[in-house]
């Protein structure tokens, strides 16, 4: 439906508050280094312009595309060249190339200071003094650090952020009320950002077909009672929403997401019995709730898949007539029967089925050729089952911190060229799979674990893409989206790696470690562990464990000492010498 003025259309659909918030997110995700005040000024200018277009859609420039309007506005920033270097060259381009250029310069790991949480009283004062600025600042700080954050979902986070301050700044014990809520929002926010980053990577690196296949599998698991045509419609709409958000079209994305939530709620009866509660909520909560809704129960007495996809004499005819539709039906039918499988496993099965049909439908006796195709699925199903069993046993034996350490060693030996901060971050996140998924019964373990690992390995892939250092990481990240995890699982110790020179400074610790939070202290120790493996990649698990145990005892001892700094200096020298001897450094 064509509108004379796209900016007026979106302003009216979304309302001023959401319009301003989404434009701020869009600008902060593009120009990640710009100061808050500069962004607010740009947003206010765009908003004032939008209002003139609402008043008169024929007014000057109101017919321009959003990309043109927003891009022109971003290109007015005076310090673009000094702050962003070659990104300033984007401004010499015309749309749509200019927007593509901005997208390519989004930085997954921007050089920004860590967000330090002020004292509760300081935050509450700031909240009361200027609530609007306080909440805008939240949107700005999250958006610039997470340039692919799902914008309509960030509005939902901001709403919860506001509610936390509204409630807790009036509480008797403000800190006890507020801090757990902020911790929860931070952790959920990081998870939400990583999940969305995988969706954008799927679309941008592997194309719409890959994303649609993922969506068919996931929605079929979630809505097993829905017809294939219904699932297909939802997949088409969902793909449009995510394509827009990943492409920086945040106003269209938020608008279309609201329309999709409305459609789902109006058609609950033909989609899922689990949507009732979600659909009673306000818009932002409703959309979030639908996205997280539990799988509906499978219809009773679903027939065997073999009849339509192996035994039927029309398999090759049906496949040839509409390949992607037929494969989509296969994926839908398989996924709705298997909520116990990960999405990536379902996609591997569909790929195996497709490969078999491609080969067999050109053979002399197609049916004879593809008759045993389902037998090929067995090892594909058993592979993640076995690995999850092994890793959950290891997690239960070690606990989260030591399980993370085992993964740190595993991945550092496989890809030692990757930067230490990236190895620590990724391995810590991989290790969280234990607490997140191993508690589940067998039927929920695989979808929990393997789909979570896909999200975390994508973090490794996007961070590595910024500064590529390892051909093996590039290969695992680019060859196949659904086989990234098996590719990393199969990697060997990198025999070509030349061990890092020993640097005593890397293993020198000071009394400041004693005042760190438990998490920060773990990160310090895990950083040392990675460095240790980089120095001695052939060290055995037993050797590394012994050194790490000594190291933990050393930190504990010196943090209890009266003269901590002297203890760290003297005992540290002894520990380094002993570790060198133990590892033959």
């Amino acid at each position: 439906d064509a509108h004379k003025s796209e900016v007026a259309h979106r302003f009216k659909d979304l309302g001023e508050e959401n319009f301003k918030a989404l434009v701020l997110i869009a600008f902060a995700q593009y120009l990640q280094q710009c100061p808050f005040e500069d962004h607010v000024k740009l947003v206010n200018e765009v908003t004032e312009f939008a209002k003139t277009c609402v008043a008169d859609e024929s007014a000057e420039n109101c017919d321009k595309s959003l990309h043109t309007l927003f891009g022109d506005k971003l290109c007015t920033v005076a310090t673009l060249r000094e702050t962003y270097g070659e990104m300033a060259d984007c401004c010499a381009k015309q749309e749509p190339e200019r927007n593509e250029c901005f997208l390519q310069h989004k930085d997954d790991n921007p050089n920004l200071p860590r967000l330090v949480r002020p004292e509760v009283d300081v935050m509450c004062t700031a909240f009361h003094d200027n609530e609007e600025t306080f909440l805008k600042k939240y949107l700005y700080e999250i958006a610039r650090r997470h340039p692919y954050f799902y914008a309509p979902e960030l509005l939902f986070f901001a709403k919860r952020y506001k509610a936390a301050f509204t409630e807790c700044c009036q509480a008797a014990d403000k800190a006890a009320c507020l801090l757990p809520k902020l911790d929860e929002l931070r952790d959920e926010g990081k998870a939400s950002s990583a999940k969305q980053r995988l969706k954008c990577a799927s679309l941008q690196k592997f194309g719409e077909r890959a994303f649609k296949a993922w969506a068919v599998a996931r929605l079929s698991q979630r809505f097993p009672k829905a017809e294939f045509a219904e699932v297909s419609k939802l997949v088409t709409d969902l793909t449009k929403v995510h394509t827009e958000c990943c492409h920086g079209d945040l106003l269209e994305c938020a608008d279309d997401r609201a329309d999709l939530a409305k459609y789902i709620c109006e058609n609950q009866d033909s989609i899922s019995s689990k949507l009732k509660e979600c659909c009673e909520k306000p818009l932002l909560e409703k959309s979030h709730c639908i996205a997280e809704v539990e799988n509906d129960e499978m219809p009773a007495d679903l027939p065997s898949l073999a009849a339509d996809f192996v035994e039927s004499k029309d398999v090759c005819k049906n496949y040839a007539e509409a390949k992607d539709v037929f494969l989509g039906m296969f994926l839908y039918e398989y996924a709705r029967r298997h909520p116990d499988y990960s999405v990536v496993l379902l996609l591997r099965l569909a790929k195996t089925y497709e490969t078999t049909l491609e080969k067999c439908c050109a053979a002399a006796d197609p049916h004879e050729c593809y008759a045993k195709v389902f037998d090929e699925f067995k090892p594909l199903v058993e592979e993640p089952q076995n690995l999850i069993k092994q890793n959950c046993e290891l997690f239960e034996q070690l606990g989260e911190y030591k399980f993370q350490n085992a993964l740190l060693v595993r991945y550092t030996k496989k890809v030692p060229q990757v930067s230490t901060p990236t190895l620590v971050e990724v391995s810590r996140n991989l290790g969280k799979v234990g607490s997140k998924c191993c508690k589940h019964p067998e039927a929920k373990r695989m979808p929990c674990a393997e789909d979570y690992l896909s999200v975390v390995l994508n973090q490794l892939c996007v961070l590595h893409e910024k500064t590529p250092v390892s051909d093996r990481v590039t290969k695992c990240c680019t060859e196949s989206l659904v086989n990234r995890r098996p590719c990393f699982s199969a990697l060997e110790v990198d025999e070509t790696y030349v061990p890092k020179e020993f640097n005593a400074e890397t293993f020198t610790f000071h009394a400041d470690i004693c005042t760190l939070s438990e998490k920060e202290r773990q990160i310090k120790k895990q950083t040392a562990l990675v460095e240790l493996v980089k120095h001695k990649p052939k060290a055995t698990k037993e050797q590394l464990k012994a050194v790490m145990d000594d190291f933990a005892a050393f930190v504990e001892k010196c943090c209890k000492a009266d003269d901590k700094e002297t203890c760290f200096a003297e005992e540290g020298k002894k520990l380094v010498a002993a570790s060198q001897a133990a590892l033959g450094l």
Epitope: P379, L380, Q390, N391, A406, K414, N483, A490
Partner: nanobody
Framework: QVQLVESGGGLVQAGGSLRLSCAAS??????MGWFRQAPGNEREFVAS????????NYANSVKGRFRISKDNAKNTVLLQMNSLKPEDTAVYYC????????????WGQGTQVTVSS
């Protein structure tokens, strides 16, 4: 447990070819590989293949000359060695690992490969 039995070693002229075979019984391994050890040297990695997906890894020294493959039906891994050089002379060991850690849990007895110049 995984039991591994190698075969196919022998004496060959430089530039010639050999095919090593390793039969696995017991549990299905996750990855199977070949290592080699020449007299006075450390054991070194040669090649590996993941059982389910067929992902392969090769040492730089054998890339383009050696090819690892598997026969799932026979639970066997093959190492086709072409353009052999005297420096390929070693005892070749088949090995298996049961999981993602790049350390091998099970080892065969080894088979001697001698390349004469």
């Amino acid at each position: 447990q995984v039991q591994l039995v190698e075969s196919g070693g022998g004496l060959v002229q430089a530039g010639g070819s050999l095919r090593l075979s390793c039969a696995a019984s017991g549990r299905t391994p996750y990855v199977m590989g070949w290592f080699r050890q020449a007299p006075g040297n450390e054991r070194e990695f040669v090649a590996s293949i993941s059982w389910t997906y067929g992902y392969t890894n090769y040492a730089n020294s054998v890339k383009g000359r050696f090819r690892i493959s598997k026969d799932n039906a026979k639970n066997t891994v093959l190492l086709q060695m072409n353009s052999l050089k005297p420096e390929d002379t070693a005892v070749y060991y088949c090995a298996a690992r049961r999981g993602e850690d790049p350390e091998y849990d099970y080892w065969g007895q080894g088979t001697q490969v001698t390349v004469s110049s």
